[in-house]
């Protein structure tokens, strides 16, 4: 008796597909061992057709896959474009050889069934319409025309030419003739449902001279498309319902027993479980739209349906499209914290993952907005200048090659709280959703800059100091000059970090930046920050104004370490960096297949596309190394 379980018999028809699930006992060894699907020959030998090691036989090339779901203790074999040659005995199993644990599966593929020659078959999808053609002889032209549906005992009238209509077809059935052709009438039935499927007879005339035609109407539920996605990745449901519903409200819902619960629709309804990680995007005037869900969770797996109806809710007899979404917990997308906490006046450093194989891809950060259908305007990107309202407080640091880029936002206010997406123009699965929570500051900031009101005088020397607590002693301190293309890190040496002193004097820990001599280009925002390797931590910002010396006044340059800045920015260390050990991550967002879509979804203004260096030190037009001298007091 095998511990592997699956379907003993599978039957289908030519051209169709099968999805065979095999269940295995819940052990670590089983979860990680090779899975296979083999065909049994007359000799008893079982020839591998596909395995989880990546093997794919020639006869399955391009039409089969095998996917392991270790969290469910199952694996699935999908085979498409079936032919009668696929009929046979198979095994699904586990183990390094095909003699391991296995289960016997019999697959039978038959020809498409044929109906009697006098029956006309119409095959339509749910929600669509059908026009049945009913020919008749000229002598029956003046006679009554009708269509009836066969039941066990009789044939129940659907519609006739005297305008009698069955109550269940009112508003859906029309009997008509085209032009001057007196040898054929037509019956159109719209908003087809499963109940409309069956055998019909159309008739012209009565008695033995009547013209009759048998019709078999097949109403199909759309075959669900199988979608396999990784945990924390994103999924796009591309819904194409046709021009006839182009002006109706659109929805995406998830099946729950026999109801379908709306997740999002174009009338503004949205399931709270998807807050911050879903967008619905009308594509064109042909009834096409897409729904993007990011940061996939285990519980997002299930059966989804998209449709259109003026109510924005599922209605029988309206066109639908369906998917079955599987969420694989063996994800390549790193597990990162989904909630980042900051305080008013403070800063956050958000580490955004991207596919390390695509280090040259363009990186973006956008803010999810739930109004309307939802959109995500880009705030900053490697070739998108920082939005004006974020001047001096937002920058993107690209660290090519290591699979992470960092977005820093400082001078936080409670209005910054919300959902943000990390995304690239590359692999669309790597989209992360971050929820930023901003609490009111309750204590002094960790980093403080003096002087607070910084006005430098042209041609003179100007020094600003950044005070930091002892807990940052071992971290790298830096100053950078902010521009809307990034924050250019200025050359520095941190003498304090190299001192082998064990003690730390809280009052004397500071890193200074000196502008000598001050030029007009030095005006702008400067950031003082801490980082450890490529992991960025807290920052604080200061605006340095540059003015010409006024005659008769001598400019005092305050560098007194006790002149503490009261507006300096604060952030709790535990929450400021996204790289901490205890991060309990999840989401990762997902839309935008290409750059243009980022614009479309985010309603991006043209100026956002301006090119430029986004925070890497080598793209700056002006080198500051000769001017900016950093030293430690």
């Amino acid at each position: 008796k095998s511990p592997i379980f699956g379907p003993q018999e599978v039957s289908s028809i030519e051209g169709d597909s099968v999805s065979i699930t095999c269940y295995y006992p819940d052990t670590s060894v089983n979860r990680h061992t090779r899975k296979y699907w083999c065909r049994q020959g007359a000799s008893g030998m079982c020839t591998t057709l596909i395995s989880s090691n990546g093997y794919l036989s020639k006869e399955y090339s391009g039409r089969a896959n095998l996917i392991n779901f270790p969290e469910n203790n199952t694996f699935v074999i999908n085979i498409e474009q079936l032919t009668q040659d696929d009929t046979g005995s198979y095994k699904c199993g586990l183990g390094t050889s095909n003699r391991g644990l296995s289960f016997d599966v019999s697959l039978e593929v038959s020809q498409v069934p044929e109906l009697p020659s006098d029956t006309h078959v119409y095959t339509k999808d749910i929600g669509r319409n059908v026009t049945i053609e009913c020919p008749f002889k000229r002598e029956n032209a003046p006679s009554k025309k009708s269509l009836c549906k066969k039941t066990n005992q009789s044939c129940e009238l659907v519609i006739d030419s005297t305008e009698k209509v069955n109550p269940s077809y009112i508003g859906r059935a029309k009997l008509f003739m085209k032009g001057t052709d007196l040898t054929v009438f037509y019956v159109n039935i719209s908003h087809l449902t499963h109940n409309d499927a069956g055998l019909y007879i159309c008739q012209a005339g009565e008695g033995p001279s009547a013209d009759k035609k048998n019709v078999d109407l097949q109403v199909l539920a759309p075959e669900p498309e199988l979608l396999y996605k990784d945990l924390r990745s994103s999924v796009t449901f591309e819904c194409d319902l046709g021009r006839e519903v182009a002006n109706e409200a659109k929805y995406l819902c998830r099946m729950n027993k026999e109801t379908c619960d709306v997740i999002i629709n174009t009338l503004g309804k949205r399931d709270p479980d998807f807050e911050g990680r879903i967008l619905i995007t009308p594509k064109d005037d042909n009834g096409r739209f897409s729904v993007l869900i990011t940061g996939l969770r285990k519980e997002d797996a299930g059966h989804y349906q998209c449709g259109a109806h003026s109510s924005g809710l599922p209605q029988e007899g309206w066109p639908i499209q369906t998917w079955q979404l599987f969420v694989n917990e063996e994800s390549t997308i790193p597990n990162r914290r989904s909630v980042v906490k900051g305080v008013t006046g403070g800063s956050v450093a958000i580490a955004c993952p991207y596919n390390p194989k695509e280090s040259s891809s363009l990186k973006y950060w956008c803010r999810w907005e739930g109004d309307g259908n939802g959109h995500c305007p880009v705030l900053v990107g490697t070739q998108a200048q920082v939005q004006e309202e974020y001047e001096g407080r937002l920058a993107l640091f690209d660290q090519p090659g290591n699979g992470t880029y960092t977005v820093i936002l400082n001078q936080l206010t409670t209005e910054d709280a919300g959902f943000y997406w990390c995304l690239t123009n590359g692999d669309s699965r790597w989209r992360t959703t971050i929820e930023l929570q901003v609490a009111e500051a309750t204590r002094e900031p960790n980093l403080e800059v003096t002087p607070q009101n910084a006005t430098a005088v042209l041609g003179e020397t100007f020094t600003v100091s950044c005070h930091y607590p002892c807990k940052f002693y071992s971290q790298e301190k830096y100053w950078c000059k902010w521009s809307n293309k990034g924050c250019h890190i200025l050359p520095s040496h941190d003498e304090g970090a190299r001192q082998s002193s064990v003690s730390c004097d809280q009052s004397s820990q500071l890193v200074s930046m000196t502008l000598n001599p001050v030029s007009k280009e030095d005006e702008g925002w400067y950031w003082c920050g801490v980082k450890q390797g490529q992991t960025y931590g807290e920052t604080t910002a200061i605006y340095i104004a540059v003015e010409e010396r006024t005659r008769g006044s001598s400019h005092v340059n305050p560098t007194d370490a006790n002149a503490r800045a009261k507006v300096a920015l604060e952030e709790e260390v535990v929450d400021s960096s996204i790289s901490e050990k205890e991060n309990k991550a999840i989401p990762n967002p997902g839309p935008f297949a290409n750059e243009r879509e980022i614009q479309n979804v985010g309603d991006q203004a043209q100026e956002n596309r301006a090119s430029g260096d986004a925070g890497s030190a080598d793209g700056q037009s002006r080198s500051s190394s000769s001017k900016h001298h950093h030293h430690h007091h």
């Epitope: 499963h194 059966h303 349906q305 369906t322």
Partner: nanobody, 129 residues
Framework: QVQLVESGGGLVQAGGSLRLSCAAS????????MGWFRQAPGKEREFVAA??????????YYADSVKGRFTISRENAKNTVSLQMNSLKPEDTAVYYC????????????????????WGQGTLVTVSS
């Protein structure tokens, strides 16, 4: 709401046959799963057989104890599922329950009772030796 009605139970001698039927009221399921479970006196309810379908594709599942003796089948137009039971044994004596899941695609392990949304009242099968 879908209602399931079982029929065909009764008394039969060991080695004999019975055919159980389960009729689902309401509209035809375009895809889904129907199964048979049984509960012998003083024992837990256990899986017997199941059938899943979507479009023209059908999947049949059997418990090891009934493999080769029982056959599950479905009549699409009538919305019914049947269980043909041959070579019956005294240990097959139980109340047989029909269960159904109406869904776009049938979900998890068909042996799990939580996989089914609707249940019938049961029909008693007694196999005498």
């Amino acid at each position: 709401q879908v209602q399931l009605v079982e029929s065909g139970g009764g008394l039969v001698q060991a080695g004999g046959s019975l055919r159980l039927s389960c009729a689902a009221s309401g509209r035809a399921f375009s895809s889904g799963r129907m199964g048979w479970f049984r509960q012998a006196p003083g024992k837990e309810r256990e899986f017997v057989a199941a059938i899943s379908w979507s479009g023209h594709t059908t999947y049949k599942y059997y418990a090891d104890s009934v493999k080769g003796r029982f056959t599950i089948s479905r009549e699409n137009a009538k919305n019914t599922v049947s269980l043909q039971m041959n070579s019956l044994k005294p240990e097959d004596t139980a109340v047989y329950y029909c269960a159904a899941r109406q869904s776009l695609v049938a979900g998890g392990d068909p042996r799990g009772q939580s996989e089914y949304d609707y249940w019938g009242q049961g029909t008693l099968v007694t196999v005498s030796s």
